[in-house]
C-alpha cells in the first residue's frame, strides 16, 4: 500500500504535490509498512477494540486562516475515555477515585508501556530496532525521553505526509509559502504502541485556509453603549475602534502596518499606523465603515525579465517544466517584500443616548419615626443626551467591590432630565454608590462615596462624587453584573 491509500479517500495528483511543496514533508506515493501499521477501513470491527475501555477521540485544531508565507500550526489532542489519562512516563493510567461504567479499577494502568519497552526485545544497544520506525521505515528520532512517546501521528495534506512521534498532544507547523490559496484539507491518523507493532486508534480531519488577504477583525467599544455587539452606537461620544490582526506565527512582526479608515460620514480618509483609533459621529443615521490594512510582508520575488527571444535549438538539456515546480520566482536567498492587504467593512447605526450623568446633591431624609438602623438618602441626579427610562443603584463597600444591595426601577423623567433617587442605607459608615441611568441603547454611570452618620441629629451627610466611568451592565432579575469593556488582546507592533 502507498500512503495515499491509507490516509486519504482519493489519490492526490503529482500536480498537487508540485504546486504545494511543504518543507520536510514526503510524497504520499511512498510505501506504507502495513505489517507494522495495520490499516483498517471505516466500520471495521477491530476499531471497537483498538483501545481499552472505549474509543479515543482525536481533536485537530489549527490557527487558520494563514496569510500565505506565514506558518500555520496544527495541534492534535487525544481525548481518552473517562477516568483515563497519560502519566509523566507516557503510560495511560486510571485517575484516582474516578468511577466509570466499569467501576474503580484495581490495576492502575490502562497501558503500561514502560514495562513493554524494558523488555528490550533484541535491540542493538542504540535503542534502534526493526519496530522503532515510522510507517515509511524512517527510524524514530531519539530525543531525550523518546521512549515515553507512545503515539505515532501521521499528518497528510496536499499529497504529502509528515510523521511524528509524540504523547497525547502534538503540534506541527507548516510554512505556507508554496501552498495554493484557498481551503485545504488536513487529515491525521493516530497509532498507539502495541507490543512490537502499532494499532490505529483515531482519525481526524479539518479544513484550513491559506489566504493572501490579511485576516482582520475590529472590535468597537464606546463609553455608555449598552450593547457593544449590536453595532449601534451613540452620537457625540467617541467610539474606539481596535484592529486585531490574526497573525499567530508573527509573520508581520517586522512589517510596518498602515490603517486607512473611512467612517462613512464625509469626514474623509484617516490614515494611521496605530491599531486603535477613536471617532465621534455627530449625526444620527446609518454609516458604512471601511478599513483597509496594508503591510509590507515577506513575499515571493518577481521573476527576472525574460531573456530576448531566441530560435529554439533541438537540445535535450531542458528538463520538463514540472522538474522545477518552484520556477525562477522562488530563489531562496532573495529577500523580497510584497504589499499585503486586509479589509474590514461594517454598517453601524448612530442613535441618541445618555451621554453623561451627575449627582448634584445628596440629602439625608429626616424621618418622622426613624428606624433603629436605617437611613434614607436622596440623590439629585442630572443627565445629558437622551431621556433615561430606568435607574439602577448598586450600594457596596467603600472599595466598590463587595455589593450589598442592587436595585433597578423604571423612571419617568422630563426634558430637563432632573430626578431624585431615594435609597435606604442600613447603618452608619462609608458606602460606594454606583448610579446608572439607562435607556434602550445606552447606560451612563456615576459613582460616589458617601458617609452615612450615626442617627445623631447633629451629624451631617458627607459625599465625595466621582465622575461617570463607562461600565456596561446586564440586567437579570434585579441582579447587576458589571464587567469591563476593554478586555481585548492586541497584535502590537
Amino acid at each position: 500500500k502507498r500512503f495515499h491509500d491509507v490516509l486519504g479517500n482519493e489519490r492526490p495528483s503529482a500536480y498537487m504535490r508540485e504546486h504545494n511543496q511543504l518543507n520536510g514533508w514526503s510524497s504520499d506515493e511512498n510505501d506504507w509498512n502495513e505489517k507494522l501499521y495495520p490499516v483498517w477501513k471505516r466500520g471495521d470491527m477491530r476499531w471497537k477494540n483498538s483501545w481499552k475501555g472505549g474509543r479515543v477521540q482525536a481533536v485537530l485544531t489549527s490557527d487558520s486562516p494563514a496569510l500565505v508565507g506565514s506558518n500555520i500550526t496544527f495541534v492534535v489532542n487525544l481525548v481518552f475515555p473517562r477516568c483515563q489519562k497519560e502519566d509523566a512516563n507516557g503510560n495511560i493510567v486510571y485517575e484516582k477515585n474516578c468511577r466509570n461504567e466499569a467501576g474503580l479499577s484495581a490495576d492502575p494502568y490502562v497501558y503500561n508501556w514502560t514495562a513493554w519497552s524494558e523488555d528490550s526485545d533484541g535491540e542493538n544497544g542504540t535503542g534502534q530496532s526493526h519496530h522503532n520506525v515510522f510507517p515509511d521505515g524512517k527510524p524514530f528520532p531519539h530525543h531525550p525521553g523518546w521512549r515515553r512517546w507512545n503515539f505515532v501521528y501521521v499528518f497528510h495534506t496536499l499529497g504529502q505526509y509528515f510523521q511524528k512521534l509524540g504523547r497525547c498532544s502534538v503540534r506541527v507547523s507548516v510554512n505556507t509559502a508554496n501552498v495554493t490559496l484557498g481551503p485545504q484539507l488536513m487529515e491525521v491518523t493516530v497509532y498507539r504502541r502495541h507490543g512490537r507493532a502499532y494499532v490505529p486508534i483515531a482519525q481526524v480531519k479539518d479544513v484550513y485556509v491559506v489566504t493572501d488577504q490579511i485576516p482582520v477583525f475590529v472590535t468597537m467599544s464606546q463609553k455608555n453603549d449598552r450593547n457593544s455587539s449590536d453595532e449601534t452606537f451613540l452620537k457625540d461620544l467617541p467610539i474606539t475602534f481596535d484592529v486585531l490582526i490574526h497573525d499567530p506565527s508573527h509573520f508581520l512582526n517586522y512589517s510596518t502596518i498602515n490603517y486607512k479608515w473611512s467612517f462613512g460620514d464625509n469626514t474623509g480618509l484617516f490614515v494611521s499606523i496605530n491599531h486603535t483609533v477613536n471617532h465621534t459621529y455627530v449625526l444620527n443615521g446609518t454609516f458604512s465603515l471601511n478599513l483597509t490594512v496594508k503591510a509590507a510582508a515577506p513575499g515571493p520575488c518577481p521573476p527576472p525579465p525574460p531573456p530576448p527571444p531566441r530560435p529554439p535549438k533541438p537540445t535535450p538539456s531542458l528538463g520538463p517544466a514540472g522538474d522545477n515546480p518552484l520556477g525562477l520566482s522562488e530563489i531562496p536567498d532573495e529577500n523580497c517584500q510584497i504589499n499585503r492587504y486586509g479589509h474590514f467593512q461594517a454598517t453601524i447605526t448612530i442613535v441618541e443616548g445618555i451621554l453623561e450623568v451627575n449627582i448634584i446633591q445628596t440629602t439625608d431624609v429626616l424621618m418622622l419615626v426613624p428606624g433603629p438602623d436605617s437611613s434614607l438618602i436622596d440623590f439629585v441626579v442630572t443627565c445629558q443626551g437622551s431621556i433615561p427610562t430606568e435607574v439602577c443603584t448598586i450600594i457596596s463597600d467603600p472599595t466598590c467591590e463587595i455589593t450589598q444591595n442592587a436595585v433597578c426601577s423604571p423612571v419617568d423623567v422630563d426634558e430637563m432630565c432632573l430626578l431624585t433617587v431615594r435609597r435606604a442605607f442600613n447603618g452608619s459608615g462609608t458606602y460606594c454608590v454606583n448610579l446608572t441611568l439607562g435607556d434602550d441603547t445606552s447606560l451612563a454611570l456615576t459613582s460616589t462615596l458617601i458617609s452615612v452618620p450615626d442617627r445623631d441629629p447633629a451629624s451631617s451627610l458627607r459625599m465625595a462624587n466621582s465622575g461617570g466611568g463607562g461600565l456596561n451592565d446586564i440586567f437579570e432579575a434585579q441582579k447587576i453584573e458589571w464587567h469591563e469593556h476593554h478586555h481585548h488582546h492586541h497584535h502590537h507592533h
Epitope: 503529482a14 500536480y15 508540485e18 493572501d212
Partner: antibody, heavy 119, light 107 residues
Amino acid sequence: QVQLVQSGAEVKKPGASVKVSCKASGYTFTSYWMHWVRQAPGQGLEWMGEINPYDQRTNYAQKFQGRVTMTVDKSTSTVYMELSSLRSEDTAVYYCARSTGNYAWFAYWGQGTLVTVSS
Amino acid sequence: DIVMTQSPDSLAVSLGERATINCKTSQDVSPSLAWYQQKPGQPPKLLIYSASKRYTGVPDRFSGSGSGTDFTLTISSLQAEDVAVYYCQQHYSIPLTFGGGTKVEIK
C-alpha cells in the same frame, strides 16, 4: 460569475511575436493558476503552460520552452501569453483556462483568440 | 510525458442509444482524469473531473468511470445536442496532456 475575456484575433508574419491577453473577473484573481491551451484548425487540444498570478511562478511545456512567456498584471487581473519566433504551424486558436484550486481541470475557459501566422 | 490514446476517433450513435468513449493513459493517473465536450467555434466544456465526478450542471446522462490507465466516458442516451468532439485530459502531472478527441455524430 467567473469570466475570462481574451483579446481579439491577430495576423502575424513568420518570425514575429504575438501577445494574447486574458482578463479575469468574478473571482479572486491571485487564488488560481491560469493555463494556456491551443488548438490548431481541425486538431486537438495542446497544453502550453501555466502561471500563478499570486507569485508569477510558471511552468511551460517543453515544446514551447524558450519561445513562450506568460506574465501577469495584477492591477488589471490580466494574464498575458507571448509566443515568439512564430511559424505557420503556430496558427491556432489560443485559449486561457483557469484551474480549480489544486486540480488542473478547467471549468472556465476564455472565448479563444485566433492567431494566424502567414507570410 | 503521459500519452493519452482516445478511441474511437469517431462514433455514430442513434438518438437515445448509448455512446461509449475510451481513453487509455501511458501510466497510472488515477483518478486524475477529466472529460470535455467541444462544439464548433466554442471552447471546451468540462463534463467530468477526477474520473467520475460530474461537474455542476452537467446532465446525468454523462458519466465517467475507470481507474489506473483505462477510463470511459458514457452518454447513456444520446441527445441531438450531444453532437460534438469529446476529449479526455489527465490532470495528474505536468505537462498536462489531452487525448486526440472522439467525434460523436448521430446515426
